[in-house]
């Protein structure tokens, strides 16, 4: 899966809920940041995250489609230079410094669910996708034969008016 | 090349049923996110019903809620659309249009050319 | 559900002139925006998506703008051939068409 252009085609800035509506949260603890899966107080202020869209191609022995075999890929970032990284021997999600441009593990195809509600899977472990796993975020192995539905897997994007800090 | 082909449009009296089909070639239908839009005579372009690439998610118009079906055979390549109880305000061309992006209902690019339904007694 | 509302419904210009088209939702869309062209007798074409993004075969005269709420189409040189009814699309929450605006050549 090769990404057509270094530029996204698109930023959106909102912010991250499992389908269950507990927020994803960021915190920098000893000089590094965790991610935890929390349900917030009532006007607490939910974290931001910058969502970047880039198009990718699909491997040709994949796809017949030829010129318009398009994915959307998706770097998550919720604070300057800081991305969301699969570690995929580790079955974890970690906040990283990176410089541009970014490597593949920063890198996830965008499965949307309806609009608003989507899933986010690994690019360099097809099959495996961001999931929530006791009150963290992990990588969950999903069957071809199990519906992508999965309660676990989705998340829900919604807008927020505030200024990312990138 | 993509191609979308609709069939089974019609005319058809108010509250009888009609089966949209569209097949689709050129692309691998199974990745893609499919729609049915359609465009009564001299008017604008109303989206009417979605269905994910799987088939497990399927989405509608208010108005054509509970009388209209999308679904899907991955196997077959085709997308119908199933309308029951067809009232005159659904005449229109309906179009069989294909989603952008592979898992994704973000966009949409590719549309057949149409098939004219005409509910009318 | 998020309205879209096109301006103007008819739009008449000469050709050569910049022709500026526009789109207004009722709710900030994210810049999940398409826009598509018909002629008479045929099916919508993609021009743009994600307010920016030229779709492949599209000639570079078309461009498109945009954030929150507020959405523009424009074609920097119109032509005879781009006589046609426009429409924007959002896909941010839901599936919306605006109504269209139709260019003529004065």
């Known amino acids: 899966m090769s990404i057509t252009g270094i530029s996204p085609i698109t930023e959106y800035l909102a912010s991250l809920s499992t389908y269950n509506d507990q927020s994803i949260t960021f915190a920098l603890e000893d000089e590094s940041y965790e991610i935890y899966v929390e349900d917030l107080k009532k006007d607490e202020k939910k974290d931001k995250v910058l969502l970047s869209y880039y198009e990718s191609q699909h491997p040709s022995n994949e796809s017949g489609d030829g010129v318009d075999g398009k994915m959307l890929m998706v770097t998550l970032s919720p604070t300057k230079d800081f991305w969301l990284h699969a570690n995929n021997k580790e079955h974890s999600v970690e906040l990283h410094k990176s410089e541009k441009p970014l490597p593949d593990q920063a890198f996830f195809v965008l499965h949307n669910m309806h609009s608003n509600s989507v899933s986010f899977e690994s690019k360099t472990d097809p099959g495996v996708f961001i999931g929530v796993k006791d009150n963290h975020l992990a990588l969950i192995k999903v069957d071809s034969s199990e519906n992508l539905s999965t309660e676990n897997i989705l998340f829900k994007l919604s807008e927020t008016h505030h200024h990312h800090h990138h | 090349e993509v191609q979308l082909v609709e069939t089974g449009g019609g005319l058809v009296q108010p509250g009888r049923s009609l089966k949209l089909s569209c097949v689709a070639s050129g692309f691998t239908f199974s990745n893609y996110w499919m729609y049915w839009i359609r465009q009564a005579p001299g008017m604008g372009l109303e989206w009417v019903s979605s269905i994910n690439n799987d088939g497990g998610n399927t989405y509608y118009l208010d108005s054509v809620k509970g009388r209209f079906t999308i679904s899907r055979n991955n196997a077959e390549n085709t997308v119908y659309l199933q309308m029951n109880s067809l009232r005159s305000e659904d005449t229109a061309t309906y179009y069989c249009?294909?989603?952008?992006?592979?898992?994704?209902?973000?966009?949409?690019?590719?549309w057949g050319q149409g098939t004219l339904v005409t509910v009318s007694s | 559900d998020i309205q879209m509302t096109q301006s103007p419904s008819v739009l008449s210009a000469s050709v050569g002139d910049r022709v500026t088209l526009s789109c207004k939702a009722s709710?900030?869309?994210?810049?999940?925006l398409d826009w598509y062209q018909q002629k008479v007798g045929e099916a919508p074409k993609l021009l743009i998506y994600f307010t920016n993004n030229l779709q492949t075969g599209i000639p570079s005269r078309f461009s498109g703008s945009g954030s929150g709420t507020d959405y523009t189409l424009t074609i920097s040189s119109l032509q005879p051939e781009d006589v046609a009814t426009y429409f924007c699309f959002q896909y941010n929450s839901g599936w919306t068409f605006g109504q269209g605006t139709k260019v003529e050549i004065k």
């Open positions: 249009v294909k989603g952008h992006y592979s898992y994704s209902s973000y966009s949409i690019d590719y």
């Open positions: 709710h900030n869309i994210n810049k999940h």
